[in-house]
């Protein structure tokens, strides 16, 4: 049987001879050279050689455990003469023994980290890690300990974990922002003779809001003309803040002073300046100087620093309003006036008023812009602003008159203002109702009494748009002698009815009926319209054959009825549209 132990070999051998590993030996070996030892497996014949007579194994090269810690080989013992094995092939191990030949290596050459300024002592910054290629299971060759070589007293490192923490209170970014820390990792548990490696950690303090804004001066003075429209910038103020980013953002506000309602302050997000702007129209004559208290404050405050004081500052802003010669100002932006359409000439409608807003209070004269009143329907008293009519009005012609009045400073005609006047003409019942169309109808000679031969409709130009209450009747001069009657339908229509049985076109070929139409408005208006009724010869179906001795041309299929309209079509000579007549025979 084979006789050997597991072999151990020290790495990194530096001797001049081959490094002896061990001896293979079979108890069948009598020392007479009859046995031959053969080696195969990892590195056999290359890294490891064997004396085939004695079984001695040697390493031919320097071995590195960190490259390969274990070699697995096979041993054979054969009869040199027959070549037959005298022992079964056997596997054995050569284990490479570690020496401390590797220094710790950090995962990064340079670490970058940030930590808020003013952080409490012991605040985590970053963790560094170094690894050692030596055998961690044997001795302390791979046991790494961390220490700080550079960066005290600001930072510390935990020896076992490599965690870097703040070590100094109140580190102020505004004082110093960048720190370079050098960390050492040493093996052998940090003992003498251990190997070491270092890394650099660049630490930046990030900003926290630990500084309030500060105005560089306590008072600012600006000027603006009184004519500045709302939104006009007057001036810029700027508070400085040692912080950066959002911690240096500043909001400006007007906290006090007489001009709180007259001015605004807005923040320019680009420059962090406060822009004072006009909020309402200024008036030099009312107030010449405004004193404001403007506050600059940080919108993003860290409560833990409030003990340092309020994160705001204030300054006084004095605004001087410069006088500007202003045009007259009307008492209203626009005037709406009403006048009845039956107003006499020189009727006063209303008045406008304007005055010079300047301290001088120059007198004002009024005029109508004739481009807006070409027909000179209205006039104005140049002294007192009274508007009056200079022509008669008619609502049915024009409901609204839109004119412009000008107020001009007498002493300075260049200074003038304009104001629109909207004059509504109120309706008066001054139009009589009229027939909606020209009515010409016919009656058959054989018509019976009380036949409806025409329906009348009326229209009226006056209000109301939504409807009128019209009444219809025969004119008094025709009422008693008429051959026809009017039936008021009470729905703003009326019917013409036959009053007798039969008409003779040879006796009377055409009747002219004067119909009086009135509204029930105030004052009542009426007109008389004439309806022409022709007497016609008709066939027994009620179709016209001739009227007033004139031949009639019928459009095919048209006939007429007792209750239907007959209309003369202007433009066609005596062509009537007809509907069927109901005969009473």
């Amino acid at each position: 049987s084979w006789m050997w132990n597991q072999f151990f070999l020290l790495e990194e051998y530096t001797g001049s001879d081959y490094q002896y590993v061990g001896k293979l030996h079979s108890d069948q070996d009598r020392g007479d050279g009859s046995l031959k030892y053969i080696l195969s497996g990892d590195g056999a014949g290359d890294l490891f050689i064997i004396n085939e007579n004695t079984g001695d194994i040697q390493a031919t090269k320097r071995l590195d455990r960190e490259e390969k810690p274990v070699y697995i080989l096979r041993a054979q013992a054969v009869n040199r003469r027959t070549g037959r094995p005298v022992e079964p092939e056997s596997e054995f191990i050569i284990k490479i023994h570690d020496i401390n030949d590797n220094e710790p290596i950090f995962t990064k050459d340079v670490y970058t980290a940030t930590v808020p300024e003013m952080a409490d002592v012991g605040t985590f910054v970053v963790q560094v890690t170094a690894t050692d290629a030596d055998d961690p299971t044997y001795g302390n060759s791979a046991k790494v300990v961390y220490s700080i070589l550079q960066g005290q007293p600001y930072f510390s490192v935990e020896s076992e974990t490599g965690i870097i923490k703040t070590a100094l209170l109140n580190m102020d970014r505004e004082n110093r922002e960048q720190y370079q820390v050098v960390i050492q990792a040493k093996d052998m548990g940090g003992q003498m003779g251990g190997l070491s490696g270092t890394t650099t950690v660049n630490i930046t303090l990030t900003d926290v809001n630990d500084n309030p804004p500060r105005f560089p001066q306590s008072t600012y003075q600006f000027k603006t003309p009184e004519s500045s429209p709302p939104g006009t910038p007057i001036g810029r103020i700027k508070a400085s803040d040692a912080d950066v980013g959002e911690n240096a953002e500043i909001e400006y506000s007007i906290t006090d002073g007489e001009g709180h309602e007259m001015f605004d302050v807005i923040t320019d997000q680009e420059t962090q300046e406060g822009i004072i702007t006009v909020k309402k129209l200024l008036d030099f004559e009312k107030k010449k100087v405004y004193t404001l208290k403007v506050e600059a404050s940080n919108p993003h405050v860290e409560p833990r620093f409030l003990y340092l004081g309020p994160f705001k500052d204030s300054a006084t802003v004095r605004i001087v309003v410069d006088d500007v010669d202003e045009p007259p100002v009307f008492s209203k932006l626009a005037y709406i006036l009403q006048i009845r359409e039956d107003a006499r000439i020189n009727t006063t409608i209303g008045s406008v008023a304007a005055q010079d807003p300047d301290a001088a209070r120059n007198p004002v004269k009024y005029s109508v812009d004739r481009h807006t009143d070409m027909d000179r329907i209205f006039n104005i008293d140049s002294g007192n602003g009274s508007i009056f009519t200079s022509k008669l009005l008619d609502r049915e012609t024009l409901l609204w008159h839109n004119i412009t009045v000008i107020a001009t400073e007498i002493n300075n005609p260049k200074q003038s203002s304009r104001v629109p006047l909207y004059i509504k003409v109120l309706d008066v019942n001054d139009n009589a109702p009229e027939f909606a169309e020209f009515y010409e109808t016919f009656v058959c000679e054989k018509a019976k009494a009380d036949q409806l031969i025409q329906t009348l409709r009326a229209v009226d130009k006056d209000d109301p748009y939504s409807g009128h209450q019209f009444s219809f009747s025969l004119a008094p001069e025709a009422a008693s002698s008429s051959n026809f009657t009017i039936q008021d339908n009470k729905d703003n229509t009326a019917g013409i009815l036959t009053r007798k049985n039969g008409y003779n076109r040879h006796e009377m070929s055409t009747y002219l009926l004067p119909v009086v139409i009135s509204d029930n408005d105030y004052p009542v208006q009426s007109s008389t319209g004439t309806v022409t009724v022709r007497v016609c010869a008709c066939d027994h179906h009620g179709n016209m054959q001739s009227c007033h001795a004139e031949a009639l041309i019928h459009p095919t299929g048209l006939s007429t009825g007792a209750g239907s309209e007959f209309r003369h079509d202007s433009g066609l000579n005596d062509i009537f549209e007809a509907q069927k007549i109901e005969w009473h025979e």
């Epitope: 309706d427 008066v428 209450q469 009747s473 009086v516 105030y522």
Partner: antibody, heavy 116, light 107 residues
Framework: QVQLLESGGGLVQPGGSLRLSCAAS????????MSWVRQAPGKGLEWVSV????????YYADSVKGRFTISRDNSKNTLYLQMNSLRAEDTAVYYC?????????WGQGTLVTVSS | DIQMTQSPSSLSASVGDRVTITCRAS??????LNWYQQKPGKAPKLLIY???TLQSGVPSRFSGSGSGTDFTLTISSLQPEDFATYYC?????????FGQGTKVEIK
């Protein structure tokens, strides 16, 4: 059906004021002129005032001009008569009536008594 | 103002009688005359407008005629419900004026 309903009458001292109302229904109120007519106890009818459909024009009998004001609210279908500086001779039943020339519908009337 | 004068101021008649009431204007009013009927404690009721046009719902026994200054209201056959006071009213010009009334009583 057309209905007119007056209210607001009562006893008032000479020089006092009253406001009469007339609520209209059953027709397009905004299309009609509306009138007030009064009747003193045991006497005939007297036209008082009229207002056109849009309210743009108003007219009064001489006996009430400057003291009475007629008005209307077309959105509420209501006619009004504001009576100021009332006199004993204003004592009457006041009717509101539809129309500006002929009065085709009348309310039931409201009695106004002016007496100290 | 235009004065309107009715005659008679009162009359007695029997059911079935033909009754005529006249109204005279102090100046021509064309056909702008209305007739109203009023019963005690009630509002007036329009009978005739524009001198001769019968208001809808009014019985055909009522008729009106005339123009200019003289007008007539005729009840062709008096019915029990026709006993009332009748007024004429002109609406030719402002102010609109009423007649003093004609009282029709049962004989």
């Amino acid at each position: 059906q057309v209905q007119l309903l007056e209210s607001g009458g009562g006893l008032v001292q000479p020089g006092g004021s009253l406001r009469l109302s007339c609520a209209a229904s059953g027709f397009t109120f905004s299309s009609y002129a509306m009138s007030w007519v009064r009747q003193a106890p045991g006497k005939g009818l007297e036209w008082v005032s009229v207002i056109r459909s849009s309210g743009s024009s108003t007219y009064y009998a001489d006996s009430v001009k400057g003291r009475f004001t007629i008005s209307r609210d077309n959105s509420k279908n209501t006619l009004y008569l504001q009576m100021n500086s009332l006199r004993a001779e204003d004592t009457a039943v006041y009717y509101c009536a539809r129309g500006g020339g002929y009065f085709d519908y009348w309310g039931q009337g409201t009695l106004v008594t002016v007496s100290s | 103002d235009i004065q309107m004068t009715q005659s008679p101021s009162s009359l007695s008649a029997s059911v079935g009688d033909r009754v005529t009431i006249t109204c005279r204007a102090s100046q021509s009013i064309s056909l702008w005359l209305n007739w109203y009927q009023q019963k005690p404690g009630k509002a007036p009721k329009l009978l005739i407008y524009a001198a001769s046009t019968l208001q809808s719902g009014v019985p055909s026994r009522f008729s009106g005629s005339g123009s200019g200054t003289d007008f007539t209201l005729t009840i062709s056959s008096l019915q029990p419900e026709d006993f009332a006071t009748y007024y004429c009213q002109q609406y030719y010009t402002s102010p609109y004026t009423f007649g003093q009334g004609t009282k029709v009583e049962i004989k």
